[in-house]
């Protein structure tokens, strides 16, 4: 951090490593939750017209797709990986693409996904074939 | 040698306006990503607002959004940044900064220069 750049305590809202340099916050789309036409396919695009700045530079993209009787959702938030969100860990917080894993919730069907490149939870992928370690 | 020079920032009242500037050199302005960050007294950084080096794609924080407005003018090297209906809990300093240029994915990508900042109070 530049010396005219205060420095302060406990501070998460700025990261850095140990030459003092900064980490970026992610972009991510966030529309909260909205409702989707995403279904039986193997990938959809979240239809969400909001690319924010992560509030905090730990935080990663975090989209939800929930089907129940009703309706279908698609949740679309900026997340830090160290907390659990629905009550899950998110375990592929530093993968680039944003590969659907399905959750355990009673009453409904439930899939998650976390990844950490720019607006990575605009293309969320629920195929099979991408959820081997893949470079790109 | 790099620099960003901030202006503009001053004493408004709440639900004011202000644009601040930051004029670039040193650097091929086109090949960066830049970005609007503040400081509040005693805070750590906000990161307010960036903008894409080329077709102008812009991003804000969620505290800002639709009421700040970032832009840049490639042609004089210059980043601006429009406040309207300003709050008091947008009293800060505002520093401009670029981006190194790199995937997007990397985690670390870094501020490699800072501008000095310009402080911006909202107070009646």
């Known amino acids: 951090i530049p010396p005219h750049v205060q420095k302060s305590v406990n501070n998460d809202m700025i990261v850095t490593d140990n030459n003092g340099a900064v980490k970026f916050p992610q972009l991510c789309k966030f529309c909260d939750v909205r409702f989707s036409t995403c279904d039986n396919q193997k990938s959809c695009m979240s239809n969400c017209s909001i690319t924010s700045i992560c509030e905090k530079p730990q935080e990663v993209c975090v989209a939800v797709w929930r089907k129940n009787d009703e309706n279908i959702t698609l949740e679309t938030v900026c997340h830090d990986p160290k907390l659990p969100y629905h009550d899950f860990i998110l375990e592929d917080a530093a993968s680039p693409k944003c590969i659907m894993k399905e959750k355990k919730k009673p009453g409904e069907t439930f899939f998650m996904c976390s990844c950490s490149s720019d607006e990575c939870n605009d293309n969320i992928i629920f195929s099979e074939e991408y959820n081997t370690s893949n470079p790109d | 040698e790099v620099q960003l020079l901030e202006s503009g920032g001053g004493l408004v009242q709440p639900g004011g306006s202000l644009r601040l500037s930051c004029a670039a050199s040193?650097?091929?302005?086109?090949?960066?990503r830049m970005w609007w960050v503040r400081q509040a007294p005693g805070k750590g950084l906000e990161w307010v607002s960036a903008i894409e080096p080329i077709g102008n794609r812009t991003y804000y924080a969620r505290s800002v959004e639709g009421r700040f407005t970032i832009s840049r003018d490639n042609s004089k090297n210059t980043l601006y940044l429009q406040m309207n209906s300003l709050r008091a809990e947008d009293t800060a300093v505002y520093y401009c900064a670029k981006q190194i240029p790199g995937r997007k994915w990397t985690a670390n990508s870094r501020f490699d220069y800072w501008g000095q900042g310009t402080l911006v109070t909202v107070s009646s």
């Open positions: 040193g650097f091929t302005f086109t090949e960066y």
